[in-house]
C-alpha cells in the first residue's frame, strides 16, 4: 500500500497455559506429561541447542502512515506485527499436561493477532481536497494459537511474514544441560 514503516521496539509474548485453546480430545490423558525431563538434552545429543527466547511470539511495533489512494494520514499510526516462532509444547512447562508431546508430530502453534483496536485517522489529500476521516483496524496484541482449519494461509499473511516463512536453522531446545536440571530454569523463564 506504499506506506513507510520503521521498527520501534519489540515485546516478547511467552505463552502460558491459560493462553492455549481447549485441548483436542486425545490430549485429555496426561498420565506421563508431568515428567520433569522436558527441558534441554544432555551435551551428547546430536542436535545443536539454542536459547528458549528464540522460540517466542513477539509483538513488533511499527509506525506507519495510513494511505488511501493519494491521501495520507496526518499522523503516523503505531501498530503491532506478530512475529516469531511458537516452539514445540516441550518448551512450555505450564502446558506439558496438555498434550502427547512425545509424538514425532503434534499441534502446530502460530504467532497470530489476538486482539484488535480501532483507531480513527484523518487523511490529508492533495489538490486542496477536504480531509477525510477513516477508521482503521490495528493489531493490539499477539498470541500463540493452535493452527486450525479456520486459520487459512491468506489469514496468516496478515499476521506478519514471519508466521509463514521458514526460519533458518533454529532449534527448539535451551542450551545443552541435563534435562532434569533444566526444568526449574524453564519454569522460571515462563
Amino acid at each position: 500500500q506504499g506506506w513507510q514503516a520503521f521498527k520501534n521496539d519489540a515485546t516478547e509474548i511467552i505463552p502460558e497455559l491459560g493462553e492455549y485453546p481447549e485441548p483436542p480430545p486425545e490430549l485429555e490423558n496426561n498420565k506421563t506429561m508431568n515428567r520433569a525431563e522436558n527441558g534441554g538434552r544432555p551435551p551428547h545429543h546430536p542436535f545443536e541447542t539454542k536459547d528458549v527466547s528464540e522460540y517466542s511470539c513477539r509483538e513488533l511495533h511499527f509506525t506507519r502512515y495510513v494511505t488511501d489512494g493519494p491521501c495520507r494520514s496526518a499522523k503516523p499510526v503505531t501498530e503491532l506485527v506478530c512475529s516469531g516462532q511458537c516452539g514445540p509444547a516441550r518448551l512450555l512447562p505450564n502446558a506439558i499436561g496438555r498434550g502427547k508431546w512425545w509424538r514425532p508430530s503434534g499441534p502446530d502453534f502460530r504467532c497470530i493477532p489476538d486482539r484488535y483496536r480501532a483507531q480513527r485517522v484523518q487523511l490529508l489529500c492533495p489538490g486542496g481536497e477536504a480531509p477525510r476521516a477513516r477508521k482503521v483496524r490495528l493489531v493490539a496484541s499477539c498470541k500463540c494459537k493452535r493452527l486450525t482449519r479456520f486459520h487459512n494461509q491468506s489469514e496468516l499473511k496478515d499476521f506478519g511474514t514471519e508466521a509463514a516463512r521458514p526460519q533458518k536453522g533454529r532449534k527448539p531446545r535451551p542450551r545443552a544441560r541435563s534435562a532434569k536440571a533444566n526444568q526449574a530454569e524453564l519454569e522460571n523463564a515462563y
Epitope: K31, P88, R90, W101, S105, P107, D108, R149
Partner: antibody
Framework: EVQLVESGGGLVQPGRSLRLSCAAS????????LHWVRQAPGKGLEWVSG????????DYADSVKGRFTISRDNAKNSLYLQMNSLRVEDTALYYC????????????WGQGTTVTVSS | QSVLTQPPSASGTPGQRVTISCSGS????????VNWYQQLPGTAPKLLIY???QRPSGVPDRFSGSKSGTSASLAISGLQSEDEADYYC???????????FGGGTKLTVLG
C-alpha cells in the same frame, strides 16, 4: 555415537509370532520416545507404533492394533515389538526410531531388521 | 494409498532448485507439524526437516520446508548429485491417531 540396532527378524509363517528387539547405545535411553516404522519391499515408510519414555503411553497404527505390542525396558536400553497373528502384508524391513524433541520428528534411526511372512 | 500425497518422482540438474509437495487434510497437515525425511538408496531414513521448517544441525541450509493450509513443501536449492534419494513427508493425523507418511518422492539428479 548414537546407535539403534534392531534384531529378531526372520522368515515366519502366516499366523505365527515374532519378537523384534532394538538395542540402544550412545545416548540417554529414557530421554527418547521410541517408535517402530516399517517399509515393505519397494514401498514407502509406514509408522507402526510408538511409546513414550516411561513406557506407559502407547500408540498403534490401525493395521497392527490388537496384533502387535510395543514395550521398552529402560534398564536394558531396549525396545521391543511383539508381533502376533502375522500376515503376509506384514512383510517388511522394520526400523527402530526415536525422537528426543517434542513434536520434532524421528531424529535417530536404526538400520532395520527384515521380517518375511510367507507360507 | 497414502494419507499424505506426494508426487512419485521429481528431477533436476545440478545447481537447480527443486520443490517437492505434500498434500494432506485438516486432520493432519492442517493442524499438526510436518516433518521431512531423506532416504538415500539402501540406507535408513534421516530426519531432514522437523516442525514444518526447522533443520536439525548438520542438515545443509539448501534444504528448507514450508507449510500452507493443508499442504507442505520441501525445497532443495543448489541441487547436488548426492541429493538423489527418496523424500518423505510425515505428520500426525488426529482422526487416525497415527503418524502418517506420504508415499515418497524419488528425486533424480540429471546429468
Amino acid at each position: 555415537e548414537v546407535q539403534l540396532v534392531e534384531s529378531g527378524g526372520g522368515l515366519v509363517q502366516p499366523g505365527r509370532s515374532l519378537r523384534l528387539s532394538c538395542a540402544a547405545s550412545g545416548f540417554t535411553f529414557d530421554d527418547y520416545a521410541l517408535h517402530w516404522v516399517r517399509q515393505a519391499p519397494g514401498k514407502g515408510l509406514e509408522w507402526v507404533s510408538g511409546i513414550n519414555w516411561e513406557g506407559d503411553d502407547i500408540d498403534y497404527a490401525d493395521s497392527v492394533k490388537g496384533r502387535f505390542t510395543i514395550s521398552r525396558d529402560n534398564a536394558k536400553n531396549s525396545l521391543y515389538l511383539q508381533m502376533n497373528s502375522l500376515r503376509v502384508e506384514d512383510t517388511a524391513l522394520y526400523y527402530c526410531a526415536g525422537n528426543s524433541r517434542g513434536y520434532g520428528g524421528l531424529d535417530v534411526w536404526g538400520q532395520g531388521t527384515t521380517v518375511t511372512v510367507s507360507s | 494409498q497414502s494419507v499424505l500425497t506426494q508426487p512419485p518422482s521429481a528431477s533436476g540438474t545440478p545447481g537447480q532448485r527443486v520443490t517437492i509437495s505434500c498434500s494432506g487434510s485438516s486432520s493432519n497437515i492442517g493442524r499438526n507439524t510436518v516433518n521431512w525425511y531423506q532416504q538415500l538408496p539402501g540406507t535408513a531414513p534421516k530426519l531432514l526437516i522437523y516442525s514444518n521448517n526447522q533443520r536439525p544441525s548438520g542438515v545443509p541450509d539448501r534444504f528448507s520446508g514450508s507449510k500452507s493450509g493443508t499442504s507442505a513443501s520441501l525445497a532443495i536449492s543448489g541441487l547436488q548429485s548426492e541429493d538423489e534419494a527418496d523424500y518423505y513427508c510425515a505428520a500426525w493425523d488426529d482422526n487416525l491417531e497415527s503418524y502418517v507418511f506420504g508415499g515418497g518422492t524419488k528425486l533424480t539428479v540429471l546429468g
